[in-house]
């Protein structure tokens, strides 16, 4: 049966690989981050914000954030030539649950942890921050970049990838096995790149009520009659019921909600209240915590970060601190344990084990891989041509083909423009990163779907504000030209 991605499911993961960090070229560059300070080590923080607008530095990382492990300890040798600075191992990964926006701001911070004789333990300071506004389609190759921040130079690569069953450049399409071999269900198309599968309905906004909400476009949440609220979880009051409280009104026959746990907002100090079954939960602003955000005046010296969280900033009671939580914990003070197994990451009936520091999947016989994603029989000895990858499932192999190729074994050249995806006379180009539309004058959008009024405003509210007429809204990747 077709189903929407549930609130807990991941749409995908943004991945960042730091290649090098060190003094930039030219005079005046520092020899090392530890000069005259004793030993130190580096770590990185990545912050993702949606859209391409210049957002205030303190605005939240609405798409997510992640913190690297600490790098190896580095001690400067005064006479020796400056080596490459040792970096933390591994990728920085930022999971996202909603559609990948394609346009985003990427903020990478390099932090120094000084390990000298600090009163109260190590000291942290921000060495460099780079901010790049980028277009990036999910599912493409690694994009490479080099950025300078003051006297420092950072080299890195990044990509966004979807977590199956989500696919597409925004991770908004779902693939499900076909109900019949020859066709998909009503209104559903074959699901590129997995042509053997069918597209599921669009992915609604995270948290949209499965009983009372629905969506026609990814990321929206439209309510059935009688329900309201951003997630369609609030019973709607009809005009004749206004002013009444209690479970129902015999005179009007309409249902009205009783007192809710968030009525009157029990969260202090600007905290926001969200209802939970039979109770409520406060999300506290920086500098406050507690059940009702009632605890304040906290600094990092008070140790507000639980479960091994890293406290940054907040040197005095007037400045806010931030807790960077280790994997498996969340909340403004890392007080909430994430039940990562609720995301059902183990495929093919594998058993999920949350070990705290890591997730493990115990696979059923015949399956293997970190998430039990490999069917040991399906892809053995099968080759997908032209850079395609073998995808297992249902006892039969199929190929997920690289851009520009199709067919069972990816041997057929596919033209991404063959379906004429650019509306209103727009031109489609078979760019290496995916199709690109150049719109005819008077139209805009990634598929030229929005007419532009003479005042430069799109006729549809779905068009992002500030978009120029004819803006392709497309995303690219650094890659070789074919």
């Amino acid at each position: 049966e077709q189903k929407l991605i549930s609130e807990e499911d991941l749409a995908g993961v943004f991945e960042l690989q730091i290649h090098s960090f060190g003094p930039g070229p030219g005079p005046g560059a520092p020899r090392s981050p530890c000069s005259a300070r004793g030993p130190c080590r580096l770590f990185f923080r990545v912050c993702l914000k949606p859209g391409l607008s210049e957002e205030a530095a303190e605005s939240p990382c609405a798409l997510g954030a992640a913190l690297s492990a600490r790098g190896p300890v580095y001690t400067e040798q005064p006479e020796a030539p400056a080596p490459d600075l040792p970096l933390p191992n591994g990728l920085l990964q930022v999971p996202f649950r909603d559609a990948w926006p394609g346009t985003f701001s990427l903020i990478i911070e390099t932090w120094r942890e000084e390990l000298g004789d600090q009163i109260g333990g190590p000291a942290w300071s921000l060495l460099a921050r780079v901010t790049r506004r980028r277009r990036l389609a999910a599912g493409g190759p690694w994009a490479r970049d080099i950025q300078r921040a003051g006297a420092w130079e950072l080299r890195f690569s990044y990509r966004a990838r979807c977590e199956l069953p989500a696919v597409g450049t925004a991770c908004t399409r779902l693939c499900r096995p076909r109900s019949a071999p020859s066709r998909c269900g009503p209104g559903l198309r074959p699901c590129a790149p997995l042509e053997d599968e069918c597209e599921a309905p669009p992915v609604c906004r995270a948290g949209c009520s499965l009983e009372h909400g629905f969506c026609e476009q990814p990321g929206e949440c439209r309510c059935l009659e009688g329900w309201t609220g951003p997630l369609c979880t609030v019973p709607a009051s009809t005009s004749s019921c206004l002013g009444l409280r209690g479970p129902s009104s015999a005179t009007t026959g309409c249902l009205v909600p009783g007192p809710g746990p968030c009525d009157g907002n029990p969260c202090a100090n600007g905290g926001s209240c969200s209802e939970t079954p039979g109770s409520f939960e406060c999300t506290c602003p920086r500098g406050f915590y507690g059940l009702r955000c009632e605890v304040s005046g906290v600094t990092c010296a008070d140790g507000p970060c639980f479960n091994g969280g890293l406290c940054v900033g907040g040197a005095d009671p007037d400045s806010a601190y931030i807790c960077h939580c280790p994997p498996g914990f969340q909340g403004s003070n890392c007080e909430k344990r994430v039940d990562r197994c609720s995301l059902q990451p183990c495929r093919n009936g594998g058993l999920c084990l949350d070990l705290g520091h890591a997730l493990r999947c115990r696979c059923r016989a015949g399956f293997a891989g970190p998430r039990c994603e490999h069917n040991l029989d399906d892809c053995a000895g099968r080759a997908c041509a032209n850079g395609g990858t073998c995808v297992e499932g249902g006892g039969a192999h199929r190929c997920s083909c690289a851009l520009g190729f199709g067919g069972r074994d990816c041997r057929e050249r596919a033209d991404p423009c063959a379906a004429r995806p650019c509306a209103h006379g727009g031109r489609c180009y078979a760019h290496f990163s995916g199709l690109v539309c150049a719109c005819a004058p008077g139209y805009m959008g990634s598929r030229c779907e929005f007419p532009v009024h003479p005042d430069g405003v799109s006729a549809l509210p779905a068009a992002p504000p500030g978009l120029r007429p004819g803006d392709p809204q497309r995303h690219h990747h650094h890659h070789h030209h074919h």
Partner: antibody, heavy 119, light 110 residues
């Protein structure tokens, strides 16, 4: 190997029509591109002449070239061609064919062919 | 007609210098960033350096960078090297499927 190669006469007389051919290999016009012609007079800058869009074979020309330039495609021979009518000495230039695959840039160029207009 | 104006038309600089070339268009380029930069050496076709205003083409040294949007764009060579002696062109793509090149900037090594 994806390549473009221009060919045609090195010398043309004034008032005649210049015909140049661009032969491509390593890709097919079944995908959608702009195939364009760009010229460069000796010691001068680059000048866009026109393009043909392989999605529907529509053509676009620089304003100065309209009425003088015709670009067409022969898919069976993997070629596209440029016709420039009523040439004068001012049309003496290196002529390049180039391919655009999106985002407005020519990512693939031929080596160019020098055409001299002289009687 | 759309005009792309490059300045300066000629510059002489020393190895290690930071060089900046500007490109101004009489109309906004398509999507506000469909502008590219090329390097051309005598007897060779142009070589793509930067596309979409700021994206470095694969294989191009990182000392080259591009910025700008709409009508005003900049190419920067951070630390000039001898092999960078060449002529540099900007090129825009415009609504209505037209292209235009700048007049070029010749960079000479002192």
């Amino acid at each position: 190997q994806v390549t473009l190669r221009e060919s045609g006469p090195a010398l043309v007389k004034p008032t005649q029509t210049l015909t140049l051919t661009c032969t491509f290999s390593g890709f097919s016009l079944s995908s959608s591109y702009d195939m364009g012609w760009v010229r460069q007079a000796p010691g001068q800058g680059l000048e866009w002449m026109g393009t043909i869009y392989t999605g529907d074979y529509s053509t676009d020309y620089a304003s100065w070239a309209k009425g003088r330039v015709t670009i067409s495609v022969d898919t069976s021979k993997n070629q596209f061609s440029l016709k420039l009518s009523s040439v004068t000495a001012a049309d003496t230039a290196v002529y390049y064919c180039a391919r655009h695959t999106g985002y407005g840039y020519f990512g693939l160029w031929g080596q160019g062919t020098l055409v001299t207009v002289s009687s | 007609d759309i005009q792309l104006t490059q300045s300066p038309s000629f510059l002489s600089a020393s190895v290690g210098d930071r060089v900046t070339i500007t490109c101004q268009s009489t109309e906004s380029v398509y999507g506000s960033d469909w502008l590219s930069w090329y390097q051309q050496k005598p007897g060779q076709p142009p070589k793509l350096l930067i596309y979409q205003a700021s994206n470095l083409e694969i294989g191009v040294p990182s000392r080259f960078s591009g910025s700008g949007s709409g009508t005003d764009f900049t190419l920067t060579i951070n630390s000039l090297e001898a092999e960078d002696a060449a002529t540099y062109y900007c090129q825009g793509y415009y609504s209505g499927y037209s292209y235009a090149f700048g007049g070029g900037t010749k960079v000479e090594i002192k």
